[in-house]
């Protein structure tokens, strides 16, 4: 068994069930018009 608080993660999705949003680092920050 394991109890963990985890560590902060910046990883992108890597497997089909990773549960992660894409979170691309190069996404535009331009606001919608």
């Amino acid at each position: 068994s394991e109890t963990t608080t985890g560590t902060s993660s910046n990883s992108s999705q890597s497997t089909s069930n990773s549960g992660l949003a894409p979170n691309p680092t190069n996404a535009t920050t331009k606001a919608a018009g």
């Epitope: 985890g6 993660s9 089909s16 069930n17 992660l20 949003a21 996404a27 535009t28 919608a32």
Partner: antibody, heavy 117, light 113 residues
Framework: QVTLKESGPALVKPTQTLTLTCTVT?????????VSWIRQPPGKALEWIGY???????RYNPSLKTRLTISRDTSKNQFVLTMTNMDPVDTATYYC??????????WGQGTTVTVSS | DIQMTQSPSSLSASVGDRVTITCRSS????????????LTWYQQKPGKAPKLLIS???TLASGVPSRFSGSGSGTDFTLTISSLQPEDFATYYC?????????FGGGTKLEIK
């Protein structure tokens, strides 16, 4: 059948620490996915709090980050949300939900937490 | 953070009506790597948890009736109910599942006229 169920105190006092548990059935929490905590103040919209991934890694909403810890107990197939320094504005229904790579596909029933002295 | 804006905030309609709810994001939700829009729609009834309706802007979740459809790309998205049924009266939320922190729209409450 995948189910998630939140449990914890219905009432906490200001400045106290809130601890909520999300018990998962229907899949092993180490096999994949994330589980996020999401809250909804009365009559208001949903707010994402943070997630813990099946690997144990976590990510928190920056607006709440300093007050949060999300952990897991793999032997019990459970996740735990800890939120410190509770304030009346934290009064809300708190949900846990399973995250895929596109959405939250399964949600718990929610647990209502009132912060009041 | 990505801001999600829904309109209208409330809507009165009758059974059988065609209803459209719009959602706008403050930046594009189109992921260039897979050409998918990371926009999700949920339905919530009073006292209940949200229920997944649509992911990737237009993909119906399992068991969701075909009268629900989603469309749009980039920053502008639409949820359409082709013929309202009594069980469809609820609040609908859009959500961006693209960049952390994940954010939701303010909701659209669909009421009986």
């Amino acid at each position: 059948q995948v189910t998630l169920k939140e449990s914890g105190p219905a009432l906490v006092k200001p400045t106290q620490t809130l601890t909520l548990t999300c018990t998962v059935t229907g899949y092993s929490i180490t096999s994949g996915y994330t589980v996020s905590w999401i809250r909804q103040p009365p009559g208001k919209a949903l707010e994402w709090i943070g997630y813990i991934q099946y690997t144990g890694s976590t990510r928190y909403n920056p607006s709440l980050k300093t007050r949060l810890t999300i952990s897991r107990d793999t032997s019990k197939n459970q996740f735990v949300l800890t939120m410190t320094n509770m304030d009346p504005v934290d009064t809300a229904t708190y949900y846990c939900a399973r995250g895929t790579t596109a959405s939250f596909d399964y949600w718990g029933q929610g647990t209502t937490v009132t912060v009041s002295s | 953070d990505i801001q999600m804006t829904q309109s209208p905030s409330s809507l009165s309609a009758s059974v059988g009506d065609r209803v459209t709810i719009t959602c706008r994001s403050s930046q594009s939700l189109l992921y260039s790597s897979d050409q998918k829009n990371y926009l999700t729609w949920y339905q919530q009834k009073p006292g209940k948890a949200p229920k997944l309706l649509i992911s990737w802007a237009s993909t119906l979740a399992s068991g969701v009736p075909s009268r629900f459809s989603g469309s749009g790309s980039g920053t502008d998205f639409t949820l359409t109910i082709s013929s309202l049924q009594p069980e469809d009266f609820a609040t609908y939320y859009c959500q961006q599942y693209f960049i952390y922190p994940l954010t939701f729209g303010g909701g659209t409450k669909l009421e009986i006229k």
